[in-house]
C-alpha cells in the first residue's frame, strides 16, 4: 500500500544532478534519478519511469521500495545487494515491471524483507533459488512473510515448454527457505493443478489465494498441515466438486474461511456429500451464492437448496443395452 506521507514530503532527484555526482560514491541519503523519496516515510518510489535496472544509489533508510511499471526484464543475483546493505528494506513492490527472469539469489542481502510483490510480470524463467538464494538442500530461512505472485504467468507461447506450476513450486520449496511465509497469493496464473507437496512445506500460511486459476480438482492436495490457515481463496476456478477427504480436512482447520464462488459445480450424485457439508459448515463464505453449472437441467440451482433426490447420475448401461 502507498505510504501515508503526503506527496509534498517526497523529494525528487533531478536527472542532471544525479549525473553530475555519479562519479563520486553515492551520498547515503540521496534520491536516485527518476525516483521520489521520503525519508520521513522511509519510502522510495520509482514508478512508471521505464527504468531498465534497479537503481544502485538507493538510500540506506529505505523501508518501502516501489519499483513498479518499469522495464527491468531481469533481476540478477544480488540485485539489491549494497554496501552497506539495505538493512531496513521490508516491503518491495516490483509489480508490472516487465520482468521475465528472476535469477538465483536475486533478493539476497535483504535481511528485513518481509513483503515481496512480483505480480503482473511474465515470469518465463523463475530460478528455483530466486527466494532461497542458494542451492543447498536447507537454506537459511528467508525473512519473507508475504509473497504476492498474482498474474505472473507468461503467454502460452513463451513458457519454454516447461510446467509453469512446477517452476513456481520449485521456487517456493527450494531449501525450505519460506517456512515462515504467512501470505501467498498465486491468483490468475492459469494453474491447472496444485502440486501435492507445496502446502505441506509451507506450514505457517495464514492466507492462500488461488483464485482465477484453472484448478479442476483438489483431490491430491492436502490442507491438513495448514493449521494456521485463515483464508483460502478458490473463486473463479474450474472446480466441479469437493470430495469427502477435502471437506474433512477443511472442516478440521480451526480458523479457516473458504471462498468458492464462480466455479462450475457439477450437481450429480457425486455432489451429495458436498451439499450435505455445505448445509452444516460455517467455513464457506457466501455459500448461499454457490450454484450448479452442470448438468443443463440443474444450471443455476443453488447448492444449499438441493436435496439428495436432485442429485442423480445417469446410469452407465452395459454395452449390450446401449443404443447408438
Amino acid at each position: 500500500s502507498s505510504p501515508t506521507s503526503s506527496a509534498s514530503s517526497f523529494s525528487s532527484s533531478a536527472p542532471f544532478l544525479a549525473s553530475a555526482v555519479s562519479a563520486q560514491p553515492p551520498l547515503p541519503d540521496q534520491c536516485p534519478a527518476l525516483c521520489e523519496c521520503s525519508e520521513a516515510a522511509r519510502t522510495v518510489k520509482c514508478v512508471n519511469r521505464n527504468l531498465t535496472e534497479v537503481p544502485t544509489d538507493l538510500p540506506a533508510y529505505v523501508r518501502n521500495l516501489f519499483l513498479t511499471g518499469n522495464q527491468l526484464a531481469v533481476l540478477p543475483a544480488g540485485a539489491f545487494a549494497r554496501r552497506p546493505p539495505l538493512a531496513e528494506l521490508a516491503a518491495l513492490n516490483l509489480s508490472g515491471s516487465r520482468l521475465d527472469e528472476v535469477r538465483a539469489g536475486a533478493f539476497e542481502h535483504l535481511p528485513s524483507l518481509r513483503q515481496l510483490d512480483l505480480s503482473h510480470n511474465p515470469l518465463a524463467d523463475l530460478s528455483p533459488f530466486a527466494f532461497s538464494g542458494s542451492n543447498a538442500s536447507v537454506s537459511a530461512p528467508s525473512p519473507l512473510v508475504e509473497l504476492i505472485l498474482n498474474h505472473i504467468v507468461p503467454p502460452e507461447d513463451e513458457r519454454q515448454n516447461r510446467s509453469f506450476e512446477g517452476m513456481v513450486v520449485a521456487a517456493l520449496l527450494a531449501g525450505r527457505a519460506l517456512q515462515g511465509l504467512r501470505r501467498l497469493e498465486l491468483a490468475s496464473n492459469h494453474f491447472l493443478y496444485l502440486p501435492r507437496d507445496v502446502l505441506a512445506q509451507l506450514p505457517s500460511l495464514r492466507h492462500l489465494d488461488l483464485s482465477n486459476n484453472s484448478l479442476v480438482s483438489l483431490t491430491y492436495v492436502s490442507f491438513r498441515n495448514l493449521t494456521h490457515l485463515e483464508s483460502l481463496h478458490l473463486e473463479d476456478n474450474a472446480l466441479k466438486v469437493l470430495h469427502n477427504g477435502t471437506l474433512a480436512e477443511l472442516q478440521g482447520l480451526p480458523h479457516i474461511r473458504v471462498f468458492l464462488d464462480n466455479n462450475p459445480w457439477v450437481c450429480d450424485c457425486h455432489m451429495a456429500d458436498m451439499v450435505t457439508w455445505l448445509k452444516e459448515t460455517e467455513v464457506v463464505q457466501g455459500k448461499d451464492r454457490l450454484t450448479c453449472a452442470y448438468p443443463e437441467k440443474m444450471r443455476n440451482r443453488v447448492l444449499l437448496e438441493l436435496n439428495s433426490a436432485d442429485l442423480d447420475c445417469d446410469p452407465i448401461l452395459p454395452p449390450s443395452l446401449q443404443t447408438s
Epitope: T52, Q71, L72, A73, P76, D100, D125, P154
Partner: nanobody, 122 residues
Framework: QVQLVESGGGLVQPGGSLRLSCAAS????????LAWFRQTPGTEREFVAA????????RYADSVKGRFTISRDSAKNTVYLQMNSLKPEDTAVYYC???????????????WGQGTQVTVSS
C-alpha cells in the same frame, strides 16, 4: 552457434521510415535479449534498442526514443526495428546482437550479425 541475419537497410530521405529485421537461428535456447547497435566509421558501436525474447521489456537509447520501435516475433526468433522520422545522423551500419543479459553495453552480447547499411540523405 547462433547465426544472426539482418535485412531491410537502404537509402531513405530525411523524415522517412525503414524497417530492419534480424532473424536468429542455431542454438538460440540460451538467448534472452536481442538488440540493435549501430556504428559509423571510426567510432565504437552505439546501443540503439533491445528487447527480451521471452518477455515484454524494451529499452532504447535516448537519441532514438519516440522515433524507433523494437518488436519481436518469438515464434520466428525474429526482431524488428521500425525507424521513423529518420535523420541524417541516423546514417550507420546497423548490427543485430544477441545475448543473455539485459544490457546497453556491446560487451554483454556474444553473437553479432554482419550488419546492414542505413543511409539517410536527400
Amino acid at each position: 552457434q547462433v547465426q544472426l541475419v539482418e535485412s531491410g537497410g537502404g537509402l531513405v530521405q530525411p523524415g522517412g521510415s525503414l524497417r530492419l529485421s534480424c532473424a536468429a537461428s542455431g542454438h538460440t535456447f540460451d538467448i534472452k535479449t536481442l538488440a540493435w547497435f549501430r556504428q559509423t566509421p571510426g567510432t565504437e558501436r552505439e546501443f540503439v534498442a533491445a528487447i527480451r525474447l521471452w518477455g515484454t521489456a524494451t529499452r532504447y537509447a535516448d537519441s532514438v526514443k519516440g522515433r524507433f520501435t523494437i518488436s519481436r516475433d518469438s515464434a520466428k526468433n525474429t526482431v524488428y526495428l521500425q525507424m521513423n522520422s529518420l535523420k541524417p545522423e541516423d546514417t550507420a551500419v546497423y548490427y543485430c546482437a544477441a545475448g543473455r543479459d539485459w544490457s546497453a553495453f556491446s560487451s554483454a552480447y556474444d553473437h553479432w550479425g554482419q550488419g546492414t547499411q542505413v543511409t539517410v540523405s536527400s
